[in-house]
């Protein structure tokens, strides 16, 4: 049975040239994470494996860096990166949990972080 | 050892859909060591890399952007193969294909192609 | 994209003597995250696909004899045999695999002077 839960930083709005920080945080569950995979609609931006450690895609190589912990720290971002981001943690022996942040870049120069909240 | 044999036509016609195999022994499409490419080669456009399919803890997809509209790589467990879908052939898609294991050695998202398939001419004709 | 130029377009190199091919990227590719340097060197011959012999800029694949060396930082790299042998008049290419698209060098074709 699957009894944890992902914390996630939530809706984010950064600025266009900025960096932001993607965070999830499995909970309530004593499984043993294998791997992380951070997903944006369907293309992998990075992996960190539990024994192998980080690994980052070619299409990101210059604009991902890893961590801190398992989050993802996104740079120069651009108004095309707006959208959903996933975090989904491999785990064993509960298998997968998935979080999701929606990431807003905006033109002006305020950016408000919006509140955590939780998938199950 | 690694082998990749390909298979399919060698003649298309315009505006046609390429279709090609590359079944692999010595390894597995499903490898979280490996990825699994399509290449092509001609005198105008040199080599050319089309795109990859890969599988760590699901299956992912990357293709040029010079033919992301019309390409299609799907990987076949039961057959241990996979196989690329080229939409709308062009005389200018007339080219040697090749599959192509990507060894992910020390990062396990990119390497160097390290094992070929033995190459299909397609040409686009009417 | 990262454009791959190599230099000269064609050699032609006495038996037993050295071959150097250059290769210019027109950006790094070096990840400064694990410093390692994206590029490869395949050779070709005809009729056949092209043959990995050297990775991560100066690794020399299984097989390959060590009568080929690979060199290079930053965006310059060099491709050199010590001493040429007949079986290695083939067309060389670099390639990165640092960024998509994955981009490959014209090709250098080296013949025996």
């Known amino acids: 049975m699957m009894t944890g839960t992902i914390e996630t930083t939530g809706n984010i709005s950064a600025e266009k040239g900025g960096s932001i920080i993607l965070q999830c945080h499995l909970s309530s569950t004593t499984a043993q994470v294998t791997q992380v995979n951070w997903e944006q609609q369907d293309q992998l931006l990075a992996i960190c494996n539990a024994d192998l450690g980080w690994h980052i895609s070619p299409s990101f190589k210059d604009r991902v860096a890893p961590g801190p912990g398992l989050g993802l720290t996104l740079q120069s971002l651009t108004v095309n990166d707006t959208g959903e981001y996933f975090c989904i943690y491999h785990t064993y022996p509960d298998g997968t949990y998935t979080g999701r942040i929606f990431l807003e870049v905006l033109e002006s120069s305020v950016a408000e972080h919006g509140a955590r909240f939780q998938i199950p | 050892q690694v082998q990749l044999q390909q298979s399919g036509p060698g003649l298309v016609k315009p505006s046609q859909t390429l279709s090609l195999t590359c079944a692999i022994s010595?390894?597995?499409?499903?490898?979280?060591?490996?990825?699994w490419n399509w290449i092509r080669q001609s005198p105008s456009r040199g080599l050319e890399w089309l795109g990859r399919?890969?599988?760590?803890?699901?299956?992912?997809?990357d293709y040029a952007v010079s033919v992301k509209s019309r390409i299609t790589i799907n990987p076949d467990t039961s057959k241990n193969q996979f196989s690329l879908q080229l939409n709308s052939m062009t005389p200018e898609d007339t080219a040697v294909y090749y599959c192509?294991?990507?060894?992910?050695?020390?990062?396990?998202?990119?390497?160097?192609?390290?094992?070929w398939g033995q190459g299909t001419l397609v040409t686009v004709s009417s | 994209d990262i454009v791959m130029t190599q230099s000269p377009d064609s050699l032609a190199v006495s038996l037993g003597e050295r071959a150097t091919i250059n290769c210019k990227s027109s950006?790094?590719?070096?990840?400064?995250?694990?410093?390692?340097?994206?590029l490869a060197w395949y050779q070709q011959k005809p009729g056949q696909p092209p043959e990995l012999l050297i990775y991560?800029?100066?690794t020399r694949e299984s097989g390959v004899p060590d009568r080929f060396s690979g060199s290079g930082s930053g965006t310059d790299f060099t491709l050199t045999i010590s001493s040429l042998q007949a079986e290695d008049v083939a067309v060389y290419y670099c390639?990165?695999?640092?960024?998509?698209?994955?981009?490959f060098g014209q090709g250098t074709k080296l013949e025996i002077k």
């Open positions: 192509a294991r990507e060894r992910a050695l020390y990062d396990i998202l990119a390497g160097s192609f390290d094992y």
């Open positions: 010595g390894d597995s499409v499903s490898s979280n060591s490996a990825v």
């Open positions: 399919t890969y599988y760590r803890s699901k299956w992912y997809n």
């Open positions: 950006q790094s590719v070096l990840f400064g995250f694990n410093n390692k340097i994206y």
């Open positions: 991560w800029a100066s």
């Open positions: 390639q990165q695999y640092y960024s998509f698209p994955y981009t």
